[in-house]
Amino acid sequence: FVRTKIDTTENLLNTEVHSSPAQRWSMQVPPEVSAEAGDAAVLPCTFTHPHRHYDGPLTAIWRAGEPYAGPQVFRCAAARGSELCQTALSLHGRFRLLGNPRRNDLSLRVERLALADDRRYFCRVEFAGDVHDRYESRHGVRLHVTAAPRIVNISVLPSPAHAFRALCTAEGEPPPALAWSGPALGNSLAAVRSPREGHGHLVTAELPALTHDGRYTCTAANSLGRSEASVYLFRFHGASGAST
């Protein structure tokens, strides 16, 4: 299920119109598209241009992160007069052109979404040959990837004075709430660290001091679901064994 956020203040879409008496380029992209991890999403992009009946060579490009300089994730090229835009680049084979650039449509389908795909994407078209022009969406479309929680790491670590602490890291969007439960704990939201820089979907919770042997369970929950994982603490002869 894919949701396209409509921004009524921008005439339903982010429409970038750049015109003068001799030229008129515009690109229409929605501000945001939402989809769940594992699903597919469509990034809509249509354009108008000042070159009437252009049928020369063209290249369609999508890039991620920032306009003009972000890494390309998709590129295809159409020869003069051809309606077929032959894919030259599709990152991890997950990007596919849905639109027909000859009909001013650069819409892109992204398969098997992952949280790492949650970023801004920019469509671009280049005309080559007799007419020599190019244009790129500067605002782009934000792909918002949602995901049920997944615990990516749970561990017991030594800490000073022969004590032990437990760490639980989970990912999800919205970022999940983490809770620890275990011997003499009840439910604890112990020391949740906010998402790390550059890892916006990761949340870590720490239990700073494990005072009893037994099973400690970390639960991650958001609006899309919950996940849990456990570690076991057994202390003997001043050492510990922990398993998950």
Epitope: L89, A128, Y135
Partner: antibody, heavy 118, light 112 residues
């Protein structure tokens, strides 16, 4: 680190041919247009030719059209310039450059001198 | 062809002073709002050219903020504040709006 390294140029007689090549590293080669820019001794910069991502589209300045051929090998990350029917006015240092449309000629090779003389 | 006209041809500057180079194009280099295809390059003696400024006013990677580009449409300026000895060389403006891509004839900066 982005690097562009041109092959050696040399002395060539008028009417003869020479092929220049440029080895690129440090970036995703096929994501960029590439170009050759030349500079005659004690003169300014003069764009020669550009080639598109897959090498489908080439652009040339009028004075070299029909004589020079720009090409690329994305598998080997190399750019080439085949120069035929060379003239004395083609004498110059030839630079290969990465052409970032909105970012200019962002990176340049060290240049290689081509001298056309009898 | 778009002609890029640079002035002055040369200038001699005292270290610490500022320098200004002008570039005029024979046609507007404005493609669309916020997108003007003019660039500045520096070629130090015996070296390859190096990108200084892209799209009128954006500093290329590693370029000190003593360099500042400005202008619009057909008139562009490169200003160097607090000139240093390492700034000597030939400065070129260039355009990537239309084929053939063209450069100015260059401005030679010397230190007094």
């Amino acid at each position: 680190e982005v690097q562009l390294v041109e092959s050696d140029g040399g002395l060539v007689q008028p009417g003869r041919s020479l092929k220049l090549s440029c080895a690129a590293s440090g970036f995703t080669f096929s994501d960029y247009y590439l170009a050759w820019v030349r500079q005659a001794p004690t003169k300014g910069l003069e764009w020669v030719a550009s080639v598109s991502y897959e090498g489908i589209t080439n652009y040339y300045r009028d004075s070299v059209k029909g004589r020079f051929t720009i090409s690329r090998d994305n598998a080997k990350s190399t750019l080439s310039l085949q120069m035929d029917s060379l003239r004395s006015e083609d004498t110059a240092t030839y630079y290969c450059a990465r052409q970032d449309w909105e970012g200019g000629f962002a990176y340049w090779g060290q240049g290689t001198l081509v001298t056309v003389s009898s | 062809d778009i002609v890029m006209t640079q002035t002055p041809l040369s200038l001699s500057v005292t270290p610490g002073a500022s320098a200004s180079i002008s570039c005029r194009s024979s046609k507007s280099l404005l493609h669309s709002p916020g997108l003007t295809y003019v660039f500045w390059y520096l070629q130090k003696p015996g070296r390859s050219p190096r990108l200084l400024i892209y799209r009128v006013s954006n500093l290329a990677s590693g370029v000190p903020d003593r360099f500042r580009g400005s202008g619009s449409e057909t008139d562009f300026t490169l200003k160097i504040s607090r000139v240093e000895a390492e700034d000597v060389g030939i400065y070129y403006c260039g355009q990537l709006l239309e084929n053939p891509f063209t450069f100015g004839s260059g401005t030679k900066l010397e230190i007094k």
